[in-house]
């Protein structure tokens, strides 16, 4: 560790005195202290002499000697007071800049330690300190305002009592800066813009921050726009607003607009797209298939996406039949707006009834005309089966009718004994009918098919079963010949009816 001579912590001299401070170390040494007049520095190997033959109050301060080559970074210090009866203060800085909640050192150094008892800190022109200003004093360093606040950004003076009167230092400006959490907050409105050529448009780019030192600009396709800036301060934030007003837009105004703001913490940017169109437009689309199939009793939501400019003047859902003249309940239709020019319209159809199959159309209108999008809704049904015994062209025939949607497939089973439903162990014969005759097949209705099984002789201790199935379910009908006549059995667990 370097050694300073004289080996005292502080030295008090009068103005005009000669002061010699000598520092000796193992290697080369350096002096560090407030740059001030009249000092001369002589270095001689491992010692360095700081001297003046005309000390002034401006030489008051702490002088530290360090050994740059010392890995431990040891240093020695001495504080020099040059006690000038006319100058109780040596102010080392005209301005102090700190962030909020940091301690702010106002470096007015007392030139005479005897005056310490009568010191105080005031604002310029003798105004008292603001309430809740918490400060302390050190004759070597000055006044420290603890946990400085933005509102304490003021001009201060240090005051000392000399011979019963207060003597002020020159003023020190304190700038307490807001702690800037990051780049300025940005808004760019609208988020998207569409205009017809010749219409007016407005784009507003605004940025705000707790600190006034930030820049904001608006650019169009990477070209910075020259727009007058409006500034404001509210809610403890500085706001800067750029408003681009276009009286009659044209195609060259279209494109990407970016609002960019920056401060010491960095840069933020946000963008929007401006479309200029020749005329009004209205586009309807759906992510769903326009042909829908749903099992009876289940629910369905029909969704239509609308892209339009100008906005819609009217819209509605309509049921086009074929079953009834009922119209969808308004409470089942709702609209959600994705953004200014895109909307989603939903029609909810819960617990679908047979009479609700058919065509549903969404109609919308704007100044560009009207458009419609139509969904076709077909209901799926499990098969319903019935069997009768009849003679066709003199031959005994079992006739099976099955109706459902999608079109059912038909299988005949012959099994031993009398039963409501043939099981595997009883089955004697199985016939698949790959091409049953279609009796009816109208849009949105069930498909009815008929299958014929020609039986030369009915075996009386046997059961004939017609089974039908489709993607929804299956149905069956058992036919049991009885000597007194044919007897038919629908299964016990027969069909669910909505």
């Amino acid at each position: 560790i370097p050694v300073i001579e004289p080996s005292v912590p502080e030295l008090v001299v009068k103005p005009g005195a000669t002061v010699t401070l000598r520092c000796v170390g193992n290697g080369s040494v350096e002096w560090d202290g407030p740059p001030s007049p009249h000092w001369t520095l002589y270095s001689d190997g491992s010692s360095s002499i700081l001297s003046t033959n005309n000390a002034t109050f401006q030489n008051t301060g702490t002088y530290r000697c360090t050994e740059p080559g010392d890995p431990l970074g040891g240093s020695a210090a001495i504080h020099l007071y040059v006690k000038d009866p006319a100058r109780p203060w040596n102010v080392l800085a005209q301005e102090v800049v700190v962030f909020e909640d940091q301690d702010a050192l106002l470096p007015c150094l007392l030139t005479d330690p005897v005056l310490e008892a009568g010191v105080s800190l005031v604002r310029v022109r003798g105004r008292p300190l603001m309430r809740h200003t918490n400060y302390s004093f050190s004759p070597w360093h000055g006044f420290t305002i603890h946990r400085a606040k933005f509102i304490q950004s003021q001009d201060y003076q240090c005051s000392a009592l000399m011979g019963g009167r207060k003597v002020m230092s020159i003023s020190i400006r304190l700038k307490v800066q807001k702690v800037i959490p990051g780049p300025p907050a940005l808004t760019l409105v609208p988020a998207e813009l569409v205009r017809i050529r010749g219409e007016a448009a407005q784009i507003v780019c605004s940025a705000s921050s707790v600190d006034v030192n930030f820049d904001v600009f608006l650019q169009h396709n990477n070209t910075k726009l020259a727009i007058p800036q409006q500034s404001d301060f509210h809610n403890n934030r500085y706001q800067k607003v750029l408003t681009l007003n276009l009286d009659q837009v044209d195609f060259q105004h279209a494109g990407n607009y970016s609002c960019v703001a920056s401060n010491v913490q960095g840069k933020h940017s946000t963008s929007m797209f401006f479309r200029v169109v020749e005329s009004a437009y209205l586009n309807l689309s759906s992510e769903q298939n326009l042909i829908q199939e749903v099992t009876v009793g289940e629910g369905l939501n029909l969704k239509v996406m609308v892209e339009a400019y100008p906005g819609l003047q009217g819209f509605n859902w309509t049921y086009l039949g074929p079953f009834s003249d009922h119209q969808p309940e308004p409470k089942l239709a709702n609209a959600t707006t994705k953004d200014t020019y895109r909307h989603t319209f939903t029609l909810s159809l819960p617990r679908l009834k047979p009479s609700e199959a058919g065509r549903y159309s969404f109609l919308a209108r704007n100044p560009g005309g009207w458009r419609a999008l139509t969904f076709e809704l077909t209901l799926r049904y499990p098969p319903e089966v019935s069997v009768i015994w009849t003679f066709i062209n003199g031959s005994g025939t079992l006739l099976c009718a099955a109706s459902g949607y999608p079109q059912p497939n038909v299988t005949w089973l012959q099994c031993s004994g009398h039963t409501d439903r043939c099981d595997e162990a009883q089955v004697l014969q199985v016939w698949d009918d790959p091409y049953p005759e279609v009796l009816s097949q109208e849009p949105f209705h069930k498909v009815t098919v008929q299958s014929l099984l020609t039986v030369e002789t009915l075996e009386h201790n046997q059961t004939y079963e017609c089974r039908a199935h489709n993607s929804v379910g299956s149905g069956s009908w058992a036919f049991i010949p009885i000597s007194a006549g044919a007897h038919t059995h629908p299964p016990d667990e027969f069909l669910f009816t909505p």
């Epitope: 560090d32 407030p34 000092w39 520095l41």
Partner: antibody
């Protein structure tokens, strides 16, 4: 061994604020006094101001436009010069000030042009 | 206009001794010490002399400084081609309460 490095934009528009940062490496910014000095093209040197801890002293003719601040956590000090004109076009240097007002360590300098 | 006055140019041949003057007033050179800086083309200034006549380590003893009253001078003996540079004097100014520089002298080695 202490080294200084200036950084900041090389082009500033008239009436805007010039902002430069000086990064101190190889030593602590908490010791010594740190200065900003500039040199217009083909001209001499001009002291702008110095900072110690968080307090700064500035050349009187520039005082109203200059802010010098320090960030001890980053070992950096910075210069802000507001309302710039073409006359502020210069190479800006940061330097360490000694007790005898000598600038013993200098950054390499950064050229700042004020132009629209 | 610089506070301290220096001749704009000086020249000498290799091996020669050259002196550059710096004139001030009682508020600067008259009451404070003088420092000298060398600025080689395209580089930052370098401290050459401090406290009137002190050389930082690494500066050749061909460079020397002196002060008398309100003037100071820098002498370079045994001039070398690498000495071709701009030289600036500087001193604390009591009225400005800060350092001031001379306008600089361009030294040409012929």
């Amino acid at each position: 061994q202490v080294q200084l490095q200036e950084s900041g934009p090389g082009l500033v528009k008239p009436s805007e604020t010039l902002s430069l940062t000086c990064t101190v490496s190889g030593g602590s910014i908490s010791s010594y006094y740190w200065s900003w000095i500039r040199q217009p093209p083909g001209k001499g040197l001009e002291w702008i101001g110095y900072i110690y801890y968080s307090g700064s002293t500035k050349k009187p003719s520039l005082k109203s436009r200059v802010t010098i601040s320090v960030d001890t956590s980053k070992n950096q000090f910075s210069l802000k010069l507001s309302s710039v004109t073409a006359a502020d076009t210069a190479v800006y240097y940061c330097a360490r000030s000694t007790v005898v007002n000598a600038f013993d360590i200098w950054g390499q300098g950064t050229m700042v042009t004020v132009s629209s | 206009q610089s506070v301290l006055t220096q001749p704009p140019s000086a020249s000498g041949t290799p091996g020669q001794r050259v002196t550059i003057s710096c004139s001030g007033s009682s508020s600067n050179i008259g009451s404070n010490t003088v420092n000298w800086y060398q600025q080689l083309p395209g580089t930052a200034p370098k401290l050459l002399i401090y406290s009137n006549n002190q050389r930082p380590s690494g500066v050749p003893d061909r460079f020397s400084g002196s002060k008398s009253g309100t003037s100071a001078s820098l002498a370079i003996s045994g001039l070398q081609s690498e000495d071709e540079a701009d030289y600036y004097c500087a001193a604390w100014d009591d009225s400005l309460n800060g350092p001031v520089f001379g306008g600089g002298t361009k030294l040409t080695v012929l």
